[in-house]
């Protein structure tokens, strides 16, 4: 796992530069874990990152994402998906220019390297859920979420909104 | 236009009920969470209930000062919210405002303009 | 539960001044690194407008001169040249857990 001392090389409290045309409202570095508090960890394979789902020991430490958050502005006439309003949406960076990516077409979330300004496969849509949970929507697929699937991170549609609490999109966010 | 339009307030005898209605237009509805709250003549704003998405069934939660006697309740099929009020005393006496939250469940974005209680006898 | 303790109770100022209202929590309002913290603007007989979410983002169509500010316990709108449409009620919330508690209001009046 590298996440720890990757992150610890960002310095700043605030991203300097834009990030498509804006900045982060804020930043906050995490642990991030499954509702079933399994840790979300990243290790260097074959010269490419890995993304796993697992139990770590009693005292191994956790691997830690720097979230930063945007604002966004989101006309229900333009996006056509009758979601209007003021939204959060972050990116997710486990190690320095590295950000979690949602690949639509394999449905899957990977780690790529990446130039800023960030592409918006990059952005998700933040939800607060309730149990203290977030869960996070892929900006480029409307719902389609960050989930769970094989002990891997996967892309999982969520059908309707009912369906929006299963615990399998669902992730816990921890200073420790 | 996003829209909150509430109705079915009234004046009731203490002990009564009613049933408020809140029927939403502009955006799909049942992408988001719904609130009530409410305002006494002259008062600040109270929160009363919220009525949120969930896997199996809608979770709701209360104001310690309603629970038990009020009931919040939706309708996807008729993008509409409601709350129904029993045992109705005059400290409810209030204008009921009907709230979206934003898309994601941050923070309360849309009020509708609020339909008023009046509980005496 | 979550008590918010807004001050002053209300103001007399004029067109132009510089306008501050604070808000205390009584416990941190933080989660996820974001201050669940938000401030409404309330004329009489109309509903409450959103002003400020997440203690420092403006809400839509909102005009630059709300602002705010804080994080955990102390927040803080400013109006930083009340125009004469900003003669109000203003009432802080946070929205971190049920029940999500009010300010009791603070009246902006004119001098």
């Known amino acids: 796992a590298f996440g720890i001392s990757g992150v610890q090389k960002y310095t700043r409290a605030l991203h300097d530069s834009s990030i498509t045309g804006i900045s982060p409202i804020t930043e906050y570095l995490a642990s991030l874990s499954t509702y079933n508090d399994q840790s979300i960890t990243f290790a260097l394979e074959d010269e490419s990152y890995e993304i796993y789902v697992e139990d770590l020991k009693k005292d191994e430490k956790k691997d830690k994402v720097l979230l930063s958050y945007y604002e966004s502005q989101h006309p229900s006439n333009e996006s056509g998906d009758g979601v209007d309003g003021k939204m959060l949406m972050v990116t997710l960076s486990p190690t320095k220019d590295f950000w979690l990516h949602a690949n639509n077409k394999e449905h899957s979330v990977e780690l790529h390297k990446c130039e800023k300004p960030l592409p918006d496969q990059a952005f998700f849509v933040l939800h607060n859920m309730h149990s203290n949970c977030v869960s996070f929507e892929c900006k480029t697929d409307p719902g389609v979420f960050i989930g769970v699937k094989d002990n891997h991170l996967a892309l999982i549609k969520v059908d309707s909104s009912e369906n929006l609490c299963t615990e399998n999109i669902l992730f816990k966010l921890s200073e420790t | 236009e996003v829209q909150l339009v509430e109705s079915g307030g009234g004046l009731v005898q203490p002990g009564g009920s009613l049933r408020l209605s809140c029927a939403a237009s502009g955006f799909t509805f049942n992408k988001f969470w719904m609130n009530w709250v409410r305002q006494a003549p002259g008062k600040g704003l109270e929160w009363v209930a919220e009525i949120r998405l969930n896997s199996i069934n809608y979770v709701k939660d209360y104001a310690e000062s309603v629970k038990g006697r009020f009931t919040i309740s939706r309708d996807n099929a008729k993008n509409s919210v409601y709350l129904q009020m029993n045992s109705l005393r005059a400290e409810d006496t209030a204008v009921y405002y009907c709230?979206?939250?934003?898309?994601?469940?941050?923070?309360?974005?849309?009020w509708g303009q609020g339909t008023l209680v009046t509980v005496s006898s | 539960d979550i008590q918010m303790t807004q001050s002053p109770s209300s103001l007399s100022a004029s067109v132009g001044d510089r306008v501050t209202i604070t808000c205390r929590a009584s416990?941190?309002?933080?989660?996820?690194?974001?201050?669940?913290m938000n401030w409404f603007q309330q004329k009489p007989g109309k509903a409450p407008k959103l002003l400020i979410y997440a203690a420092s983002n403006q809400g839509s169509g909102v005009p630059s001169r709300f602002s705010g500010s804080g994080s955990g316990t102390d927040f803080t709108l400013t109006i930083s040249s009340l125009q004469p449409e900003d003669f109000a009620t203003y009432y802080c919330q946070h929205s971190k857990e049920v029940p999500y508690t009010f300010g009791q209001g603070t009246k902006v009046e004119i001098k």
């Open positions: 416990e941190s309002v933080d989660r996820y690194g974001i201050s669940f």
């Open positions: 709230i979206r939250r934003n898309y994601g469940n941050w923070f309360f974005e849309i």
